[in-house]
Interface confidence: low
């Protein structure tokens, strides 16, 4: 089985590295920069020409348990008159993040890293026009 | 930590919260999703608040490559293709979790790290500050 890039590295292994069983890795989930602040512009989700809402998904077997997802409010974009302009499109912007998934098999517990795609917000784009032959 | 439901038949020794350190399978679930935003969509060019994507590479981190968005304009692109300075292009930021090699250079020992990335830009009506 091919080991994915997360473990495969060109680094020389220092003597101080902790011993790790084959096929697994040691992960400290005490988060570095836990308390850093997002300095995003105030309520841009409402002020955007492609506004969005937030919903919180909660899963007790995931770390972190809360993941916030955005959903575009409109198909079109909001024009200067505050009306929806369907000649333009509101589209989601997405970003991958890592989570730790806990799996129960009988009474034993295992942990798995998982990539999750998070919708962060929306942007207004000119639509791609498909010309029919 | 977070609380989880437990199989009532299991011994009571199991902690309800996530332990501080866990052994994790090396295979990452969903790891083959496309991580290059330039290939996954062309929104960065078609947006009314277009952005450029800058490659941030760090071999001590997984994923080692992260793409950072930088808005191209102060204003937004209007219907005529010109920059309208009565609107603002602003970055959409997101906190994501990555793995940081700890101790440094160790191939299979990591710590979770929260980093702030600009994912793209959106066009907003500006905040008008009235001077008293």
């Amino acid at each position: 089985r091919k080991i994915p890039k997360v473990g495969h590295t060109f680094f020389q292994k220092p003597e101080s590295c902790p011993p790790v069983p084959g096929g697994s890795m040691k992960l400290d989930i005490g988060i570095i920069n836990e308390n850093q602040r997002v300095s995003m512009s105030r309520n841009i989700e409402s002020r955007s020409t492609s506004p969005w809402n937030y919903t919180v998904t909660w899963d007790p077997n995931r770390y972190p348990s809360e993941v916030v997802q955005a959903q575009c409010r409109n198909l079109g974009c909001i024009n200067a008159q505050g009306k929806e302009d369907i000649s333009m499109n509101s589209v989601p912007i997405q970003q991958e993040t890592l989570v730790v998934r806990r799996k129960h098999q009988g009474c034993s517990v295992s942990f798995q890293l998982e990539k999750v795609l998070v919708t962060v917000g929306c942007t207004c784009v000119t639509p791609v026009i498909h010309h029919v032959q | 930590g977070i609380t989880i439901p437990r199989n009532p038949g299991c011994p009571n020794s199991e902690d309800k919260n996530f332990p501080r350190t866990v052994m994790v399978n090396l295979n990452i679930h969903n790891r083959n999703t496309n991580t290059n935003p330039k290939r996954s969509s062309d929104y960065y060019n078609r947006s009314t608040s277009p952005w450029n994507l800058h490659r941030n590479e760090d071999p001590e981190r997984y994923p080692s490559v992260i793409w950072e968005a930088k808005c191209r304009h102060l204003g937004c692109i209007n219907a005529d293709g010109n920059v309208d300075y009565h609107m603002n292009s602003v970055p959409i930021q997101q906190e994501i979790l990555v793995l940081r090699r700890e101790p440094p250079h160790c191939p299979n020992s990591f710590r979770l790290e929260k980093i702030l990335v600009s994912v793209g830009c959106t066009c907003v009506t500006p905040i008008v500050h009235h001077v008293a």
């Epitope: 512009s41 | 102060l74 300075y85 602003v90 500006p126 008008v128």
Partner: nanobody, 119 residues
């Protein structure tokens, strides 16, 4: 940015900010500062389209923001400096024509120049 440095209280400094790669003919340029352990705050702003200027109360009458359109440069003349003016000073462009916007509305930022005022 350039022009930072150390000065005695009551002294003067002139900061300059050249916008390379962009012509800000109709936008906002702002000077912001951040002292250790404090939030970044707006000090002075100029609307390059018409030259309108705005100042924080703490610097009114002491600081002057100006522009040289030919050089695509904005200046901050700082007179009667006080120890509490000690901070890292940043030049930024943004604000979408509404210059008194918070720092996060400003898109392009300089690297910063240190100003230290000793008593």
């Amino acid at each position: 940015e350039s022009g930072g440095g150390s000065v005695q209280a009551g002294g003067s400094l002139r900061l300059s900010c050249a916008a390379s790669g962009y012509t800000y003919s109709n936008a906002c340029m702002g000077w912001f500062r951040q002292a250790p352990g404090k939030e970044r705050e707006g000090v002075a702003y100029i609307y390059t389209g018409g030259g309108s200027t705005y100042y924080a109360d703490s610097v009114k009458g002491r600081f002057t923001i100006s522009q040289d359109n030919a050089k695509n440069t904005v200046y901050l003349q700082m007179n009667s400096l006080k120890p509490e003016d000690t901070a890292m000073y940043y030049c930024a462009a943004g604000g979408g024509g509404y210059c008194r916007a918070p720092p996060e509305e400003y898109v392009f930022w300089g690297q910063g120049t240190q100003v230290t005022v000793s008593s």
